[in-house]
Each structure stands twice: as C-alpha cells, then as structure tokens.
C-alpha cells in the first residue's frame, strides 16, 4: 500500500487542461526530495515527463508544470492542451529514481463529444455573454423565432419573438436580428451561470417546414491560477474582467466554501485582517485593477476571486477571475518586528529588510492610508524628497550590503500612529508592513538638547549639547545635520566617555557639537542620536536658527545660552519650540500614491535634488572640541 495518494482516474476532453494533486506523508525528507510524473510503458519502464528538479520532456514542453507545495505536503502536475495521445497510465511519485514511492494514475482524454449534425459548441466563462446564431430559410422570415433548452425529451422555451422570456432568463436573454439580414436571428444570454449549460435548439417557423439549429453551451468556472509566495512577502492579484464591467464596482474576495468573503472593494469595504497591508489600484479605464497584499501570513493561503458588480459584492452570473494562493513558511524574508512602539516627542528606528542581492536598489518608506482602496504615499526614499510635514524628523539610512536599511522618525505625535511599508524598486516580494503605535509620553525623553532656543550668530562659535542617560554609556553617540537626502554625521565630542563606566554620573553625560564659525548655511535641523554599529537607537531633533549679529547686541557665550535655556521655565521653552516649528523648511511634497508611481519616485527625485539639497555634510563647519 503506497503512502502516496492521488486521483486513480482522471478524465477530460481534448484541448482541455488537468491539474493532478498528489499527496505525500508530511516528513522533512519528503518535503525536499525530488517529485516526478512519469508515463508507464508496456515494458514496465516509467519515462519521466516532468520533475521538480527542472526536467521537462519534449512532449510536455510549453504545456506542463510541476509545483511542490511543502506546506500542504502535496505537489501538483498541470497539463494543458490535452490530446488523445495523452491517454495512458502514469505515476506521480517521490524519490531520486522513478522506483521510489509512487501512486498510479490513469488519464483518459476523449474526443469532444459528438453532437447532432449542425450543432455549434459555445464555450463561455461564468458571468460572460454568449451570442447564439440561428440560421433560417427565407420561407420562415416572417415566422415565429424561438430558442428552447433541452431538458430530457422536452425543450423548454427560453425566449421567443412574441416577447416571451422564461423567468430564469429575465433581463438576461434577448432575441434580435442584425441590420438587413433576412436569414439569421441571434439570441444573447448574458450573466451566464453554471445551470445555463446544456443543449439549446433554436427554431424559425412551425411544423415540418421549421428551421432548427442545435447549440451546445458550456459554462466554465474560472481555472484558478496557482500562486506560490513566501511568508512575509507580498502578492499582487492582477484582475482583468473586461470592458463590459469597466464602470462597475470591483472587489477581491476569499472563497469560503459556497460564499466568498470580500477582502476589499472599490466602495470602501475592507476586511480588518488586511488593515494596513492591502492596496487596490485601478490600472486603466477598461476595468483592469490590481490588489496588492503585503506581509503575507500563513492564514492568507486559500482561494481568491476578483469580480465586478455594482454592489461591490460577489454576485452569481458576473465575471470572475480566480487564484489559489499558497504561502510557503520556509521564507527567505527575515522575521522583523511587525509592531513598533514609540512615545510622543520620542523617536523610533525601523529596520527594513531588503533582498541583499539588490543592495543598489532604491529604498522607500510609505505611509499606508485607509481611504477607500488604500494608498501608500512615499514619505522618504534614497532618492526621493522627504514629504512635507516630515522635514527635520524623518531620514532613511541605507546600510549597503547588510540586507537592511533603517528609517528614523522623531518628534513623534499620536497622529504618526498607523501602518507603514518598507519597499524597494527591486524584488517586489520584499515589502514589509510595520504598525507604529505612539502613546502619550509619561516621562522626560532619554535625550535632551540644550540650549532649547537654539539661535546661532553668524561668525561666532555656537555649541549645542545633548544629554544622555547612563544606559546609553556604551553606545556610540552622534550629531548629524538633517537634509532632504538623509542626516549626515558631524564631528562631535562625547564628554561622558572620559569617565569610567562604573562611576557614570547621570548629570554629566553629554555629547556636544560646535559650529565655529557659524555660517548662514548652518541653519537647519540637527539630530542627536545613539547607535551600536549599524543599529540605530533613540534620536532627538532641534532646529538651529542662524541670524546676523545685530550691532550693539551683547556677545553671549554659548555656554551662558545653554545655562539660560536650562533655567528657563517650561512655558518659555514651549514658546521657543513653536517658533522653531515656524522655521521648518517647506519643500514641495512628492506623493507617490501607488506601485506604478513608486517606480517613478527615483526619476522625479533626481530632478528635485539640486533644489532640495541645501546644506549637506560636505559643507558643514563642525569641529571637535
């Protein structure tokens, strides 16, 4: 008794396809060993036709595939364009030779069934429209025309020229003649359903002089396209339902036995299980659209259908397209945090994995928005301007060769809570979804900058200090100047590092940065942060305003300014932070709302860099103390 299981008998007709599933015992060896499909010869030899090692015989070239689904302990053999020569005995099996574990399958391919002479065969998909052509002689030009459906010996009228329509074909069947034609009438049946399949007879006239034609209608379910995706990767369902439903609402649903539960539709419905990780994008005016799902989970595996109907819900008799999605748990995409928590005023460093083989690809970070179909405007990218509202508080740090880049967002507010996507212009499977949760801060931030009302005077020396707690003692501290293409590290001086770690004094852990002499181009956002190697941690930001030295104004020592900021009451500090906010650079937003636009992000950014890149690390006049 073989532990392999499959269909013993498979029957089909010429021109069709079959999809044969073979089940194997769930063991690690079985999951990874060679799978094969071979044809049994009279001599007892089984000739391989296709195998999971990549072998494909000449007679199967271009019409067969073998896909292993280790999660299900199955493999599937798809064979298209069947001919009667494919009839025979086969084996589906496992092992390095064709004598290992196997299951015998008998395939029978028969001719297209014989119908009465003059029978025209119409093959249509569910939801589509068929036009049945009925020829008649001139003598019946003025006679009654009709179409009936054979049920056993009887033939029940579907529609006739006296305007009778069978209730089950109401609003779906019309009988008409084209132009001046005097020898053909037509019957259109729209929104086809499986029960419409069968033998039809069209007739012109009555009695022995009547003209009759036979029509065999086959209504096909959509053959699901098999999709095999890795855990945590993404999948795109490309849906093309045709021009006739271009103006109807579109949906993607997941089959659940006889129902199909809508995941997303163009009327704003969305399954909460896909919140933050789904986008529906119209592709053109002909009704084409795509649905992208990121962060695939094991439970996302299943049968999906896209369709169109004014209700945005699945409706019998409307066109659909189908997929079967398998999610492979043996994923190349690393497991990264799906939820990142921050506090108001604080910062988060989000690590985005990408395909290490594509280190030169452009990296992006976008904010998923829930409006209607979902969209994800790019906030920052390796060659994209930081979007308005994020200046001075968002930067992307690429770490070539590491297979990851880091996005830092600081000055957090509760409005920053939501879903964000990491993506590149390379391997589209490597899209990861992160949920950012920002809670109200209950204590002072770990990093504090003094002076808080940072105004530097041209030509003078300006020092700014960043206080950090002892827990950051062993980490690398840095200052960087923020610009539209990142945050460029500056020379800085860590005063806490002179002490031994045993006697860390909480009040004297300072890393300071000095501008000497201050220049106009030094104005802007500066970040103080901590990191360990390429792992970025907490950051805080401050806007440094630069002003001309007014005649007669006292020359204030930077350290006095720091002291004054420390002593200032909270209200004063708040006021100064409002003033800082008014100084934020207002750059043109560059919104990249969907996948296609994401591809163009790099090109657009190239044009913008010249104007958007004021004050980079190269032009910085920072010095170490």
């Amino acid at each position: 008794q073989s532990p392999i299981f499959g269909p013993q008998d498979v029957s089909s007709i010429e021109g069709n396809s079959v999809s044969i599933t073979c089940y194997y015992p769930d063991t690690s060896v079985n999951r990874h060993t060679r799978k094969y499909w071979c044809r049994q010869g009279a001599n007892g030899y089984c000739a391989t036709l296709i195998s999971s090692n990549g072998y494909l015989s000449k007679e199967y070239s271009g019409r067969a595939s073998l896909i292993n689904f280790p999660e299900n302990s199955t493999f599937v053999i798809n064979i298209a364009h069947l001919t009667q020569e494919d009839t025979g005995s086969y084996k589906c099996g496992l092992g390095t030779t064709n004598r290992g574990l196997f299951f015998d399958v008998s395939l029978e391919v028969s001719q297209v069934p014989e119908f009465p002479n003059d029978t025209h065969v119409y093959t249509k998909d569910i939801g589509r429209t068929v036009t049945i052509e009925c020829r008649f002689k001139e003598g019946n030009a003025h006679s009654k025309k009709s179409l009936c459906k054979k049920r056993g010996e009887a033939c029940e009228v579907v529609i006739d020229s006296t305007e009778y329509v069978d209730p089950s074909y109401k609003d779906r069947a019309i009988l008409f003649m084209k132009g001046t034609s005097r020898d053909i009438f037509y019957v259109n049946i729209s929104h086809l359903i499986p029960s419409d399949a069968g033998l039809y007879v069209c007739q012109a006239g009555e009695g022995p002089s009547a003209d009759k034609n036979n029509a065999d209608l086959q209504v096909l379910e959509p053959e699901p396209e098999l999709l095999y995706k890795d855990l945590r990767s993404s999948v795109t369902f490309e849906c093309d339902l045709g021009r006739e439903v271009a103006n109807d609402a579109k949906y993607l649903c997941r089959k659940n036995k006889e129902t199909c539960d809508v995941i997303i539709n163009t009327l704003g419905k969305r399954d909460p299980a896909f919140e933050g990780r789904i986008l529906l994008t119209p592709r053109d005016d002909n009704g084409r659209f795509s649905v992208l799902i990121t962060g695939l989970r094991k439970e996302d595996a299943g049968h999906y259908q896209c369709g169109a109907h004014s209700s945005g819900l699945p409706q019998e008799g409307w066109p659909v397209q189908a997929w079967q999605l398998f999610v492979n748990e043996e994923s190349t995409i690393p497991n990264s945090r799906s939820v990142v928590k921050g506090v108001t005023g604080g910062s988060v460093a989000i690590v985005c994995p990408y395909n290490p083989k594509e280190s030169s690809s452009l990296k992006y970070w976008c904010h998923w928005e829930a409006d209607e179909n979902g969209r994800c405007p790019v906030l920052v990218g390796t060659q994209a301007l930081v979007q308005e509202g994020y200046e001075g508080r968002l930067a992307l740090f690429d770490q070539p060769g590491s297979g990851a880049y880091t996005v830092i967002l600081n000055q957090l507010t509760t409005q920053d809570s939501g879903f964000y996507w990491c993506l590149t212009d390379g391997d589209s499977r490597w899209r990861t979804t992160i949920e950012l949760q920002v809670a109200e801060a209950t204590k002072k931030p770990d990093l504090e900058v003094t002076p808080q009302n940072a105004t530097a005077v041209i030509g003078e020396t300006f020092t700014i200090s960043c206080h950090y707690p002892c827990k950051f003692y062993s980490q690398e501290k840095y200052w960087c100047k923020w610009s539209n293409d990142g945050c460029h590290i500056l020379p800085s001086h860590d005063e806490g590092a002179r002490q031994s770690s045993v006697s860390c004094d909480q009040s004297s852990q300072i890393v300071s940065m000095t501008l000497n002499p201050v220049k106009k181009e030094d104005e802007g956002w500066y970040w103080c942060g901590v990191k360990e190697g390429q792992v970025y941690g907490e950051t805080t930001a401050i806007y440094v305003a630069v002003e001309e030295r007014t005649r007669g104004s006292p020359h204030i020592n930077p350290t006095d300014a720091n002291a004054r900021a420390k002593d200032a009451p909270e209200e004063e500090a708040m006021e100064s932070s409002v003033r800082e906010d008014e100084n934020k650079a207002n750059l043109d937003p560059r919104l990249f709302a969907d996948e296609r636009e994401i591809q163009n992000a790099g090109d657009q950014a190239q044009e913008n860099r010249a104007s958007g890149n004021a004050g980079s690390a190269g032009g910085q006049s920072g010095s170490s103390k």
Epitope: F5, P7, Q8, D9, V10, S11, S12, I13, N16, S17, V18, S19, I20, Y23, I126, P194, S195, A197, Q218, V219, L220, E221, E223, K255, K257, E258, H303, Q324
Partner: nanobody, 127 residues
Framework: EVQLVESGGGLVQAGDSLRLSCAAS????????MGWFRQGPGKEREFVAA??????????YYEDSVKGRFTISRDNAKNTAYLQMNSLKPEDTAVYYC??????????????????WGQGTLVTVSS
C-alpha cells in the same frame, strides 16, 4: 443549501454487488465534489471514494482496500452520484454516507472538507 439522500443499501452475500445512489437537490455548479464515507460497527468514519469535477475534467479517488472493486460515478443531468460495489466482503459492512461540497480543492479523504452530508444507508455483507 444542498440536500443529499442515499439509497441502495441492504443485506447481501459476500461476493455480491450493490449500487448506492446519492441524489443531490439544490444548486450544483460546474465544479464540485462528492464523496462516499463509511462507518463500520465500533469504528471511525473512513473514506471510501470521491469524485471531483471541474468544468469537463473529472477526478476519481479510491481508498486502497476498495480499489478495483468499487467504482464511483455521477449522472450530471440527474444530479446523482453512484457507488458501484462489486465483490463485496464482510468487512465492507457499514453505514455508507454520501458527502458533497461545492469546493473542488483540498484532500478528498478529509471528511472535514465536505459541507453537506446524507443521513446514511446501511450495507450488510454476510459471509
């Protein structure tokens, strides 16, 4: 909603034949699955045979112990599935259940894959 009614069970001698029928009422489409399961006295319910169809393709599955003796078939027009049982043995004695499902995916041996079940028909094979 699909209703299933089995018939054709009875008492036979070892080596005899019997044909079980399973009539389905309600909507059945151009794809679906019908299976036969059995439950012998004091035993678990077990898979016997299944038939899956998708458009013009039909797949037939059998449990090892009935291969070559039992044949599953379906009459499209009558919406009925049959189980032709030849060379019956005493160990085939059981209540035979018909199961149906609109879905043609999943392991046909798995009773959990079927949504609709008949009430069962008793087959007794005496030696």
């Amino acid at each position: 909603e699909v209703q299933l009614v089995e018939s054709g069970g009875g008492l036979v001698q070892a080596g005899d034949s019997l044909r079980l029928s399973c009539a389905a009422s309600g909507r059945t489409g151009s794809s679906g699955a019908m299976g036969w399961f059995r439950q012998g006295p004091g035993k678990e319910r077990e898979f016997v045979a299944a038939l899956m169809w998708r458009n013009t393709v039909t797949y037939k599955y059998y449990e090892d112990s009935v291969k070559g003796r039992f044949t599953i078939s379906r009459d499209n027009a009558k919406n009925t599935a049959y189980l032709q049982m030849n060379s019956l043995k005493p160990e085939d004695t059981a209540v035979y259940y018909c199961a149906a499902d609109p879905d043609t995916y999943g392991d046909p041996r798995n009773s959990g894959a079927y949504d609709y079940w008949g009430q069962g028909t008793l087959v007794t094979v005496s030696s």
